[in-house]
């Protein structure tokens, strides 16, 4: 049986034109589903806002490498978080929609608090 049939799908339809300060970011998600118009990075800020970014941009690639390094220092494995954090606000500067699909994206937590965990996207239908 396929895993997590009703897991969520987050899609980005446009990207932020602005470079976000690294200090504001908590985590990111890779968006790769063929049901989305394009592959994308969704940055999750410390205020739980989501920002779509172009994964081809050098600053985005640098940021996600930094987030990966930070996550490995603080969290030995990627864990999962409840939906509430990602439901809390609309994304910044971009259109972002959610559909339902198995394992649409993976999010990597990077904060150092022992209570913080990795997150996956959530169904908001």
């Amino acid at each position: 049986q396929p895993d997590a049939v009703n897991a969520p799908l987050t899609c980005c339809y446009s990207f932020t034109s602005k470079m976000i300060p690294m200090s504001r970011l908590e985590s990111y998600k890779r968006i790769t589903s063929s049901r989305c118009p394009k592959e994308a990075v969704v940055f999750v800020t410390k205020l739980k806002r989501e920002v779509c970014a172009d994964p081809k941009k050098e600053w985005v690639q640098t940021y996600i490498k930094n987030l990966d390094r930070n996550q490995m220092r603080s969290e030995p494995t990627t864990l999962f978080k409840t939906a509430s954090a990602l439901r809390s606000s609309a994304p910044l500067n971009v259109k972002l929609t959610r559909k339902s699909e198995a394992n649409a994206s993976t999010t990597f937590s990077t904060t150092t608090s022992s209570t913080s965990v990795g997150v996956t996207s959530v169904t908001v239908n």
Epitope: R30, K38, E39, P55, M72
Partner: antibody, heavy 117, light 107 residues
Framework: QVQLVQSGAEVKKPGSSVKVSCKAS????????MHWVRQAPGQGLEWMGR????????KFDPKFQGRVTITADTSTSTAYMELSSLRSEDTAVYYC??????????WGQGTTVTVSS | DIQMTQSPSSLSASVGDRVTITCKAT??????LAWYQQKPGKAPKLLIS???SLETGVPSRFSGSGSGTDYTLTISSLQPEDFATYYC?????????FGGGTKVEIK
Amino acid sequence: QVQLVQSGAEVKKPGSSVKVSCKASGLTISDTYMHWVRQAPGQGLEWMGRIDPANGNTKFDPKFQGRVTITADTSTSTAYMELSSLRSEDTAVYYCARGVFGFFDYWGQGTTVTVSS
Amino acid sequence: DIQMTQSPSSLSASVGDRVTITCKATEDIYNRLAWYQQKPGKAPKLLISGATSLETGVPSRFSGSGSGTDYTLTISSLQPEDFATYYCQQFWSAPYTFGGGTKVEIK
């Protein structure tokens, strides 16, 4: 539905060149990176390089640098891989694949290239 | 370049067995590891990315774990369709490199 359809099998002489095509449907190739991976008979997978079709920027495994050319035509959603100065060790199945993050979620069906005198 | 060492190179198992394949990188790859399944005459199929994230449609008997330089693919209960060759791949830095593969055969 994403599909990558590659050109047919080729038989080449040592010292010659081969050009393999990969036509994409169900995605805009300028939004992703197109990669080329090869697999010699009975062997493992070997990444050769990739192109950003939006601007033509390429990156290669140093092992292939200077011998491989990767191009893309966004108007036909097609990526190309040309390998020159062929030798018998280049006999392999050549795959195109997409992936902006460095892993490959969609693959072509593969193109067999045989180098033989 | 980052080298990926996969073990074992082959294993024999029966339907229902729990199978574990390991992959070791020569340096920290920060969970940027993918696992693929390949059947004879076919292109590889992505199973897992980001060390643990199962791709859409991949059965939940497949799971990935690990961190740093050491990663594992586990098949909790081997099914007839799982007999294939499995490859790990690091995508931390180019050139992207694959493990040598693990052939899972019927005992």
